[in-house]
Amino acid sequence: QPPPPPPDATCHQVRSFFQRLQPGLKWVPETPVPGSDLQVCLPKGPTCCSRKMEEKYQLTARLNMEQLLQSASMELKFLIIQNAAVFQEAFEIVVRHAKNYTNAMFKNNYPSLTPQAFEFVGEFFTDVSLYILGSDINVDDMVNELFDSLFPVIYTQLMNPGLPDSALDINECLRGARRDLKVFGNFPKLIMTQVSKSLQVTRIFLQALNLGIEVINTTDHLKFSKDCGRMLTRMWYCSYCQGLMMVKPCGGYCNVVMQGCMAGVVEIDKYWREYILSLEELVNGMYRIYDMENVLLGLFSTIHDSIQYVQKNAGKLTTTIGKLCAHSQQRQYR
Amino acid sequence: SAYYPEDLFIDKKVLKVAHVEHEETLSSRRRELIQKLKSFISFYSALPGYICSHSPVAENDTLCWNGQELVERYSQKAARNGMKNQFNLHELKMKGPEPVVSQIIDKLKHINQLLRTMSVPKGRVLDKNLDEEGFESGDCGDDEDECIGGSGDGMMKVKNQLRFLAELAYDLDVDDVPGNNQQATPKDNEISTFHN
């Protein structure tokens, strides 16, 4: 074993280094002391450390560790934060476009429906936005509400425009008839399937990204245990007590200490890997009816086709509904 | 046929137009994100090594510190002695992860479960019950063109519309992101960087 270098007879070097850590010299001994009160940097002979210095070293060691973790995660953290924000914003833009396209379709094809249609379309897409952000809304209910609201307007404005004002309180009956008579054919069901599948996937995608931020933040701000703090202090700072300012920890020793300090954090590894691979699988499947951009931006066309379907069957429907809703004041059809 | 907003299509036939190759779409942006995330797949297993490589560790020096004394870098004592009579490393490992880590592991398990159940098995994009309800199997094979079921004039192709980077209402800046000002700069009176 190599002989240790001669100890610093005055603790001068230790003092000048420690002053940078903690301005004020009152904690550093003038000359080496026995150090019997030390709990971490257990001396083999005289030492230039005091109990107070040891506590300061522990604090600094844990702080170093936290800062190293933060620098390790900096790029990853920004990547997820930035993308979570970008995708959330992008999804909102998709919803806004989809609403504008649908409104434009009504304005240009069915101007007589516009004031009310705009209102119902607006409510529908507001619900879509809320659902993506995690709101507890049922997608089927959203779609049903859209078609339930639209049908009375279509009936009174397109199919039966000559209806006297006194007959306008048949709306409730018309809403009920809409479902029972499958007025819009299979279009509502089709839209439900497409919208619910694409929005579910979008919602979980955003949830996953937000959890990713939480995972990184958790490890970023980990508070290390006292035991870990003592091990880090021993590794990084106890050599200073012997005046060995330029000596570095052995590589293998560092690895052992880190495995001890970070055993808990490393347990995340398995689930983190699975998270990335599962997210990749989800993303690979986000196309066609599982792609909200695709589904929502094509919705105006499907809604248009559904109205055309109603118009095509207008004669038959008007007769049936005329009978069904003739006495709607006396009985609610539902 | 439906009126298509002017900035979207001239008429329905335009929908058959091929996908613009370099158009920045949400799906391409998602794929890009996944590829970037895959760079960090070993993040947690590599953390201990990162800390050691970013803190002072004897590399070229003959002597190094093992927690108790100076030793030769390649000696048996280099990894072992510093741990003796001090803290039981096994005990430290056995304590299990911090409650906050256990909590995040539980959340990861949950989201992984959700992601798996939501993932679409390849080649099963159009559900069977949908096929039975008015989907027609048209010429919908292109990867780049997305299909939406329609009725009347059959399957139609809708091109991904968003050149969404250009559409973003703001230019996202790191400094605006909460919790992102964690640059490793200690307080003036706290010198916590290492001195080599």
Epitope: - | S42, Y50, V174
Partner: antibody
Framework: QVQLQQSGPELVKPGASVKISCKAS????????MNWVKQRPGKGLEWIGR????????NYNGRFKGKATLTVDKSSSTAYMQLSSLTSEDSAVYFC????????????WGQGTTLTVSS | DIQMTQSPSSLSASLGGKVTITCKAS??????IAWYQHKPGKGPRLLIH???TLQPGIPSRFSGSGSGRDYSFSISNLEPEDIATYYC????????FGGGTKLEIK
């Protein structure tokens, strides 16, 4: 520690193909992107493409599509780049470089393989 | 594709002095820029990633800064072993290198 050992220099005829190898050690080969970079004599660096050994996912610089084909052999932790229909323009030093674990930048590089295309 | 314009293409400086190299991206690259030192016959060496984060073992004489499209890299207190060609690399959208800067000592 991370090491990337590339195959030796190659002298090939125009029109032929060549396969350059890059053997990785000191890290989990399957979990990091492997990139390839070209440097023509007296010129700068040009990114060719990358492959993710875990699942074979690839990206190419448009200029090298059809020219370079990237593959891996996970059992030997080796990445390969095949260059086809060689011309004098392909004479260059080719580097393999690992995508980092804490950064997406290229953090470790091979020593380079010199390819000379000449008749 | 993102283009990276690096300047100057060569520069000469005195030992102990300071040099600065700049890179301008054709679009915002979100701080995803790295700087490399390349010496003949060797593979490039990563000095800095994510604009300003030093790789382990790289002296603090090397530094980087910037945001958006504009980035810079500096070496202070120049030493003889700093003679090399330096490259920037954007990695926000795949990868693009700058044209390189050849550093010579006066």
């Amino acid at each position: 520690q991370v090491q990337l050992q590339q195959s030796g220099p190659e002298l090939v005829k125009p029109g032929a193909s060549v396969k350059i190898s890059c053997k990785a050690s000191g890290y989990a080969f399957s979990s990091s992107w492997m990139n390839w970079v070209k440097q023509r004599p007296g010129k700068g660096l040009e990114w060719i493409g990358r492959i993710y050994p875990g699942d074979g996912d690839t990206n190419y610089n448009g200029r090298f599509k059809g020219k370079a084909t990237l593959t891996v052999d996970k059992s030997s932790s080796t990445a390969y780049m095949q260059l086809s229909s060689l011309t004098s323009e392909d004479s260059a030093v080719y580097f393999c470089a690992r995508g980092g674990v804490f950064t997406m930048a290229l953090d470790h590089w091979g020593q380079g393989t010199t390819l000379t295309v000449s008749s | 594709d993102i283009q990276m314009t690096q300047s100057p293409s060569s520069l000469s400086a005195s030992l102990g002095g300071k040099v600065t190299i700049t890179c301008k991206a054709s679009q915002d690259i979100n701080k995803y820029i790295a700087w490399y030192q390349h010496k003949p016959g060797k593979g490039p060496r990563l000095l800095i990633h994510y604009t300003s984060t030093l790789q382990p073992g790289i002296p603090s004489r090397f530094s980087g800064s910037g945001s958006g499209r504009d980035y810079s890299f500096s070496i202070s207190n120049l030493e003889p072993e700093d003679i090399a060609t330096y490259y920037c690399l954007q990695y926000d959208n795949l990868f693009t290198f700058g044209g390189g800067t050849k550093l010579e000592i006066k």
